[in-house]
């Protein structure tokens, strides 16, 4: 389970391999802080509900968040 | 070292089902996303989509959408390809591919799958 | 998605010589590019990522360049090994799009 309270991160593993655009249910990027020095990207799949941690340094991440935010785009009028 | 080993050539007639298999060694397999490439004869090499090895969770290319399937079973450190309904136009050498995913490329190749659909 | 055009389809050079083969992106790719050596019966070889930088021993007479749409990949020195078919990979994108492909022949 990548996420915890006990410590001030929400994250404790991250990963570099982006999920399919289709299959998130809400994808939240939370900046760095007082409590967390690092930026942290949750996605939230549709199946399950699974809470998944996302490397914001990754290559692949960063073609996700372009997807996300390019499809994103096309459903706002 | 680090190296992908596909299964051997396939022949097969229209309307069957090919299972074709990559065997990662020489790192963590669940590490790095597993991706597809067709080259048809004589033709250059077309993404198909990729696999997430974490999740086990697919995504395709829209024109490899419905007939192909990507799975895994990661005890092995194995990717597979299955082709459904095979059609003439399947022909091709399937190729499996590490994704570098920190850094976006396909760094580590198998060495290819010829899968041949003839009646 | 993004299209890449490569030209060269086929070039034919003399040992000892130099080849440069383009890519150009339908848009900008922000240097995201990569190149790789083909030979038949085996996986494409990673030669080039991030435009210019040489994976891992691959010697310095394989050379890349270029930003925005506009990418190039040259081989200096020509050797007969060599000898095989080029492509360019986008990867500013989760849809990866490969170029047509350039064969490589030695005169």
């Known amino acids: 389970v990548p996420l915890s309270r006990t410590v001030r991160c929400t994250c404790i593993s991250i990963s570099n391999q982006p999920v399919n655009p289709r299959s998130l249910e809400k994808l939240e990027i939370i900046p760095a802080s007082q409590f967390c020095p690092r930026v942290e990207i949750i996605a939230t799949m549709k199946k399950k509900g699974e809470k998944r941690c996302l490397n914001p340094e990754s290559k692949a991440i960063k073609n996700l968040l372009k997807a996300v935010s390019k499809e994103r785009s096309k459903r706002s009028p | 070292q680090i190296q992908l080993v596909q299964s051997g050539p396939e022949l097969k007639k229209p309307g069957e089902t090919v299972k074709i298999s990559c065997k990662a060694s020489?790192?963590?397999?669940?590490?790095?996303?597993m991706h597809w490439v067709k080259q048809a004869p004589g033709k250059g090499l077309k993404w198909m989509g990729w696999?997430?090895?974490?999740?086990?969770?697919?995504t395709y290319a829209d024109d490899f959408k419905g007939r192909f399937a990507f799975s895994l079973e990661t005890s092995a450190s194995t990717a597979y390809l299955q082709i459904n309904n095979l059609k003439n136009e399947d022909t091709a050498t399937y190729f499996c591919?590490?994704?570098?995913?920190?850094?976006?490329?396909?760094?580590?190749w198998g060495a290819g799958t010829t899968v041949t659909v003839s009646s | 998605d993004i299209q890449m055009t490569q030209s060269p389809s086929s070039l034919s050079a003399s040992l000892g010589g130099k080849v440069t083969i383009t890519c150009k992106a339908s848009q900008d790719i922000n240097k995201y590019i990569a190149w790789y050596q083909h030979k038949p019966g085996k996986g494409p070889r990673l030669l080039i990522h991030y435009t210019s930088t040489l994976q891992p021993g691959i010697p310095s007479r394989f050379s890349g360049s270029g930003s925005g749409r506009d990418y190039s990949f040259s081989i200096s020195n020509l050797e007969p090994e060599d000898i095989a078919t080029y492509y360019c990979l986008q990867y500013d994108n989760l849809l990866f799009t490969f170029g047509s492909g350039t064969k490589l022949e030695i005169k």
């Open positions: 591919a590490r994704n570098y995913d920190y850094d976006g490329y396909f760094d580590v």
């Open positions: 020489g790192y963590t397999f669940t590490d790095y996303s």
């Open positions: 696999i997430n090895t974490e999740t086990g969770e697919p």
